[in-house]
């Protein structure tokens, strides 16, 4: 996506001081989906625009983050800013869109991240890199550091393919390059196998 | 897609104040940004400052503080940078852009 | 401010050379972004949020990085290609650019 934290970082340095404060109190009562935990009242609210945008991205990623944003401001009646994270959205999703065209039968023969979830759970041993890597982008912070809390390397290798249901191609795919950067002969004897 | 009109040419004198201008259009200009950019010739890019059209909310880089002022008109969708006590140093093209778009650019020349 | 130096200032490449050019940051920052431009032409928006390339951008080209090290790369060098590129933050006012590494053909 990529976009997105542009997008968001417009949107909130567009509000007067006074907007940037009700979008704030909004945000902390706001429904939010399962699995996303709500940033904490204390630092959220000394934030200014640049702290709140890579907030937003960190705790949501860039995807529910944008879509976070844009229903608040709906919700604030500034259909302006929310329409232009509208458009940003729809630009992602088309360039996603085609960026994953090839990859297509990929997916029909299954992913490597899915084909090899045991032996990877079994064999690597450099998590924390990986979940360096996948972090802000992939993971969120309460993901992140939820499967940094577990013990073992197999744990977190467990705890981090319980978020892996929800993941599209390009998670996978950046999880696969982790991998591939951090275990480069574990994911080559894989690939053979 | 966002498209960004810059003033033509400007001469000036030293010591004089001068207004460039920078036309959007295709998008709603108070829902992004319009950042100023300097160049002088054969010389890098040197960000000036950021102005955020509907809140008004300006950032600075701290060598053009005092030297430049932004400022933006939502009635005509126009963004403006005023440039004051004019030296030889200020000679260069001045660019606007939004998060992806450049416009063309406007050359001063301070000269007597 | 977040100071960006960028290496080398000026290379050249054969053409179907890989290119590597890269901007350090004085502190850590999110993503970075670059920019090309032409002599005589404004700047053009290149790459996003460090790796993901701007519309009409050939795939040969990319960019990673993380923390204060970043780089743009180019798989294949190629005759258009030459051209100067700068890197930019957004992470801190005020955004700072790199002082632009000129590539040349050979």
């Known amino acids: 996506m990529g976009r997105a934290r542009d997008a968001i970082l417009d949107a909130l340095e567009n509000l007067s001081g006074d907007e940037l404060k009700k979008f704030k109190m909004k945000l902390l009562t706001v429904q939010l989906r399962e699995g996303y935990g709500r940033i904490p009242r204390g630092a959220l609210l000394q934030m200014d625009a640049i702290d709140l945008t890579d907030k937003l991205v960190s705790y949501y990623l860039e995807s529910y983050g944008l879509e976070l944003t844009m229903t608040v401001l709906r919700d604030m009646g500034l259909q302006e800013l929310a329409e232009q994270l509208q458009t940003t959205k729809e630009e992602s999703g088309a360039v996603a869109a085609a960026a994953s065209v090839p990859a297509q039968s990929t997916a029909r023969t299954g992913h490597f991240v899915d084909q090899h979830r045991q032996a990877l759970i079994a064999r690597v041993t450099e998590v924390d890199g990986v979940l360096d890597a996948l972090h802000g982008s992939v993971l969120t912070e309460g993901q992140y550091q939820a499967v940094r809390a577990e013990t073992t390397s197999q744990d977190k290798m467990r705890k981090l393919f319980s978020f892996v249901p929800s993941w599209n191609l390009t998670c996978k795919d950046s999880l696969l390059q982790a991998l591939k950067e951090i275990h480069p002969y574990l994911v080559m004897d894989l690939e053979q196998s | 897609q966002v498209q960004l009109q810059q003033s033509g040419v400007e001469l000036a004198r030293p010591g004089a104040s001068v207004k460039l201008s920078c036309k959007a259009s295709g998008s709603t200009f108070t829902s992004y940004s319009i950042t100023w950019v300097k160049q002088r010739t054969g010389q890098g890019l040197e960000w000036i400052g950021v102005?955020?059209?509907?809140?008004?909310?300006?950032y600075y880089d701290e060598k053009f503080k005092g030297k430049a002022t932004l400022t933006a008109d939502k009635s005509s969708s126009t963004a403006y940078i005023e440039l004051r006590s004019l030296t030889s140093e200020d000679s260069a093209v001045y660019f606007c852009?939004?998060?992806?778009?450049w416009g063309q650019g406007t050359t001063l020349t301070v000269s007597s | 401010q977040i100071v960006l130096t960028q290496s080398p200032a000026i290379m050249s490449a054969s053409p179907g050379e890989k290119v590597t050019i890269t901007c350090s940051a004085s502190s850590s920052v999110s993503y970075m972004y670059w920019f090309q431009q032409k002599p005589g032409t404004s700047p053009k928006f290149w790459i996003y949020s460090t790796s993901n390339l701007a519309s009409g951008v050939p795939a040969r080209f990319s960019g990673s990085g993380s923390g204060t090290s970043y780089s743009l790369t180019i798989s294949r060098m190629e005759a258009e290609d030459a051209a100067t590129y700068y890197c930019q933050q957004r992470s801190n006012y005020p955004f700072t650019f790199g002082s632009g590494t000129k590539l040349e053909i050979k």
């Open positions: 852009a939004t998060r992806d778009y």
């Open positions: 102005i955020y059209p509907r809140s008004d909310n300006t």
